[in-house]
């Protein structure tokens, strides 16, 4: 399977909410011995590999923001911790999963990564991720609402497997 990032760039005004999205592509095994661990983190554009470094989002680590479920089940973070930080991650039945960030500030600008780990029988793991940029703007040049820029087909199916 692969992870697609429908949008590679989100440009938002300060104070706005934004939902960053990734999508699981390809065949997804729905067997009872297969589960999915999905999460989000910030990173930097490394020289070797994007999304290699895992930094917190608003002080919450990728562990704090995880979703864990079987197949194409729906899930969302019910953590009070995440919601207190204006964050919520969610997943639907169609392979889409997202993180919503409320009341954006300039400090939220940066590279965001979604991570999916497919776990088979608890000892085989297949890891893929996607990356997207968030730019939060202020002042007269800032858009009135978030503007999203679609990924090229090559970018949107970027895959890194463990």
């Amino acid at each position: 399977f692969k992870v697609a990032t429908p949008y590679s760039l989100y440009v938002c005004p300060e104070g706005q909410n934004v939902t960053l999205t990734c999508r699981l592509l390809g065949p997804v095994d729905k067997g009872h011995d297969v589960t999915f661990y999905k999460t989000w983190y910030r990173s930097s554009r490394g020289e070797v590999q994007t999304c290699s470094e895992r930094r917190p989002i608003r002080n919450l680590t990728f562990q704090d923001l995880h979703l864990h479920h079987g197949g194409h089940q729906a899930a969302n973070t019910s953590h009070d911790l995440a919601q207190r930080h204006g964050l919520e991650s969610a997943s639907d039945h169609h392979g889409n999963f997202s993180i919503t960030m409320r009341n954006l500030t300039l400090l939220d600008s940066g590279l965001y990564c979604c991570l999916v780990v497919e776990i088979r029988h608890h000892h085989s793991e297949h890891r893929v991720h996607g990356a997207m940029e968030l730019q939060v703007q202020t002042g007269k040049d800032a858009p009135s609402n978030c503007v999203v820029y679609p990924s090229s087909s090559q970018d949107s199916e970027n895959i890194t497997a463990a």
């Epitope: 290699s52 562990q63 704090d64 995880h66 864990h68 780990v117 608890h122 000892h123 793991e125 463990a162």
Partner: antibody, heavy 118, light 106 residues
């Protein structure tokens, strides 16, 4: 604060069985696997196996199948490892450690020393 | 199973000296992880995904490598770095550790 609190040292007789506990606090227990690691003077660090509190699924190092049994109690956020038919070769320090999927064992218990002697 | 061979088994370094230790895998692995252990303490995660520092790890530590060859480097040795260092792989079941490199201070 993330903590993994293991049960105290044990002195047991050959042939006996025993259970070590690892109480987790400060994090979402079901979002991680709980791993168990053996450290002896002979073999350094050996991965015994893991259990997923999310669904109770386990995975064992073949070497420890029949020797170790892993269980969890979600209600108390506690992982257990039972060691069976103990021999002197099982004398070691045993650690529990949490691991997020696609990551590493980032927090470890303080270790439980097990001595098998008659 | 994948065997991880660490070298040297024992080494010593003076304060301020650069230290490099290696971990060789019997088969290719995707990522390497490094742990530090001091006597009487539990292992501590140092490096994840080959080259990334775990939370709270000093910047003098770095990791690199790919395939079957990995290394851990301390740019300037400090007294508190005296410990045993273990590499570990999650790529193939069963998950294995190296035999360790004991680093002593001169």
């Amino acid at each position: 604060e993330v903590q993994l609190q293991q049960s105290g040292p044990e002195l047991v007789k050959p042939g006996a069985s025993m259970k070590i506990s690892c109480k987790a606090s400060g994090f979402s227990f079901t979002g991680y696997t709980m791993n168990w690691v053996k450290q002896s003077h002979v073999k350094n660090l050996e991965w015994i196996g893991l259990i997923s509190p999310y669904d109770g699924g386990t995975s064992y190092n073949q070497k420890f199948k029949g020797k170790a049994t892993l269980t969890v109690d979600k209600s108390s956020s506690t992982a257990y490892m039972e060691l069976l038919s103990l021999t002197s070769e099982d004398s070691a320090v045993y650690y529990c450690a949490r691991r997020a999927y696609g990551y590493a064992m980032d927090y470890w218990g303080q270790g439980t020393s097990v001595t098998v002697s008659s | 199973q994948i065997v991880l061979t660490q070298s040297p088994a024992i080494m010593s370094a003076s304060p301020g000296e650069k230290v490099t230790m290696t971990c060789s895998a019997s088969s290719s692995v995707s990522y390497m992880y490094w742990y530090q252990q001091k006597p009487g303490s539990s292992p501590r995660l140092l490096i994840y995904d080959t080259s990334n520092l775990a939370s709270g790890v000093p910047l003098r530590f770095s990791g690199s490598g790919s395939g079957t060859s990995y290394s851990l480097t301390i740019s300037r040795m400090e007294a508190e770095d005296a410990a045993t260092y273990y590499c570990q792989q999650w790529s193939s079941y069963p998950f294995t550790f190296g035999s360790g490199t004991k680093l002593e201070i001169k």
